[in-house]
């Protein structure tokens, strides 16, 4: 009896429903009183899930499996495992018999993305070309165990002094902390990649270090150099600091934070008080810290119409300005695969392979390649559109002609959060369906 | 910002134990990944342990069973509880604050811990 079953691991993230295909070819007069069907680890011959005597006889693992009853008597054998744990990973076994009996054994490849890495610096105040720093990147909760690569601002890969932990929990779910140690050079870009290897999910996030220049002015006012990166829907801090002389009082303030662009008054404090917000009330001074000379605004709510240059005015005796840059970022969604036509294909086909990520911003940068990592650029369609809100959907169209087998990768970057969301369809040589059926 | 001051350093016999705790500023101290590292004498610092925003904890292996880590949002502290304490934990330990969402970190100061007879 010809028991089948998909060649590649099924991949499954945790927390979510798989299902194992497995079929049989039924001969004609066959009934379900005449099935024995028998899923089980293959390793220890574990029982998971089992019909027999024409009857469901119920999941062996943990109550999170069931066969698909309707399907049965086409040859459907497929199990659904629900709420996949990394625990569940490993090969699973379909044994059919009828007169005859046969086998064939599937694997699950569990997985779980890694967070965005959070980057940090120490020292981080008063850095000067020469010293020597060291940066943390640590991103969380992933499955399998990440792979971790530093480079600097031009891309060259750092390997030296770079020191990689992985701690795992209960669930199996690991944390991954890269520590790197590194002289700084005038200026310089350091970027970190966790990339999961069953995924083929990138999380990036890099830190610029620049020397500290001087601010103009008689009123020294400090900002970052760095465009303050938010999260749509998320609050940010908009950073500005003064130093105030001694004896000063806050009667003698006057902070002003303005659109630069439009000179948009946006929040004030005058006459030693708050006077509020001016723009849609989601802004906030920090009021216990001005005395301290910290006139940081906080904006709440972020949307993408706020995406821009604020401009913070600190009048004492004398006055001083900087201007800030806010940059919105909203993550783009793992990417949909389709395949059109999707049933029957054979090479020479031409087919149409459209990747649709959605409500990310600002727009995105999409990529196409094979299963060999060569760009694929001719015949392919972009198009973003946006909402209300200002997000973008992103759908790009790949019209490509079939080998015998290939493997075609949609890789959807958001800029900003240099984040790589990706997807792709492999077609194999044989006449297929897209998706694969149960 | 958020600040992070340690505290419950100091020097103990093997087989010992201790509890360090981290005070964090800030109103949004639930949505923070914590963590606690340690740092020898001569050598990189490594991760000890980490508590989730979302509850769930990781550890070192070298660790494991010994020491836990834990939280009170509603006090914006973690603690980690070291039992059994060996020479080879010898080490100042710092605390470190990841945001779930906006991807900035933040450490503390550190707190010495030595375990010696």
């Known amino acids: 009896l010809e028991v089948q079953v998909p060649e590649d691991p099924v991949v499954a993230l945790v927390g979510t429903d798989a299902t194992l295909c497995c079929s049989f070819s039924p001969e004609p007069g066959f009934s379900l009183a005449q099935l024995n069907l028998i899923w089980q680890l293959t390793d220890t011959k574990q029982l998971v899930h089992s019909f027999a005597e024409g009857q469901d006889q119920g999941s062996a693992y943990a109550n999170r499996t069931a066969l698909f009853p309707d399907l049965l008597a086409q040859g459907n054998a497929s199990l659904r495992l629900q709420r996949v744990r990394v625990a569940d990973e490993g090969s699973f076994t379909c044994f059919v018999s009828i007169r005859d009996f046969g086998s064939a054994a599937v694997s699950l490849q569990v997985a779980a993305p890694y967070s965005k890495p959070s980057m940090t610096l120490e020292p981080n105040k008063d850095l000067r070309p020469g010293d020597t720093v060291t940066i943390t990147c640590s991103s969380y909760q992933g499955y399998p165990e990440a792979e971790v690569f530093w480079q600097d601002g031009q891309g060259v890969p750092l390997t030296g002094n770079v020191t990689t932990s992985q701690m795992a929990n209960e669930q199996g779910l690991f944390d991954v902390h890269s520590i790197l140690r590194v002289v700084l050079g005038a200026n310089g870009t350091y970027s970190c990649l966790v990339r999961n290897p069953v995924l083929q999910q990138d999380a990036h996030s890099s830190v610029t270090i620049t020397p500290q220049r001087s601010p103009t002015g008689a009123v020294e006012v400090q900002v970052p150099e760095d465009p303050v990166v938010a999260l749509v829907g998320t609050d940010a801090t908009l950073r500005c600091s003064f130093s105030p002389e001694p004896g000063f009082s806050l009667a003698q303030l006057n902070l002003i934070w303005q659109l630069t662009d439009t000179k948009q008054l946006v929040h004030s404090f005058t006459e030693g008080r708050d006077q509020g917000s001016a723009y849609a009330n989601r802004t906030a001074l920090f009021p216990d810290l001005l005395a301290q000379g910290n006139a940081s605004l906080r904006l709440q709510r972020v949307r993408v119409a706020d995406e821009g240059s604020f401009t913070c005015f600190v009048s004492i005796r004398d006055f001083g300005s900087a201007a800030v840059s806010l940059q919105v970022a909203a993550p783009y969604s793992k990417p949909s695969m389709t395949l059109e036509p999707n049933k029957d294909l054979r090479p020479g086909d031409t087919v149409t392979i459209t990747c649709s990520s959605y409500r990310g911003y600002p727009e995105a940068e999409v990529f196409w390649q094979d299963g060999q990592g060569v760009p694929l650029t001719g015949n392919v369609t972009t198009s973003q559109m946006a909402n209300e809100q200002g997000l973008f959907d992103v759908h790009s169209v790949l019209r490509v002609v079939l080998g015998a087998n290939g493997t075609y990768s949609c890789l959807v970057r958001n800029p900003v959060l240099q984040q790589d969301a990706h997807g792709s369809v492999t077609i194999t040589g044989q006449p297929m369906t897209f998706p694969p059926e149960a | 910002e958020v600040q992070l001051v340690e505290s419950g350093g100091g020097e103990v016999q093997p087989g010992g134990s201790l509890r360090l705790s981290c005070a964090a500023s800030?109103?949004?101290?639930?949505?923070?990944?914590m963590s606690w590292f340690r740092q020898a004498p001569g050598k990189q610092r490594e991760p000890v342990a980490t508590?989730?925003?979302?509850?769930?904890?990781n550890y070192a292996e070298s660790v494991k069973g010994r020491f836990t880590i834990s939280r009170d949002n509603a006090k914006n502290t973690v603690y980690l509880q070291m039992n059994s304490l060996r020479a080879e934990d010898t080490a100042v330990y710092y605390c470190?604050?990841?945001?779930?969402?906006?991807?900035?970190?933040?450490w503390g100061q550190g707190t010495l811990v030595t375990v010696k007879p």
């Open positions: 800030g109103s949004t101290f639930s949505m923070y990944h």
């Open positions: 470190k604050a990841d945001h779930g969402y906006n991807a900035r970190g933040y």
């Open positions: 508590s989730h925003h979302g509850g769930t904890t």
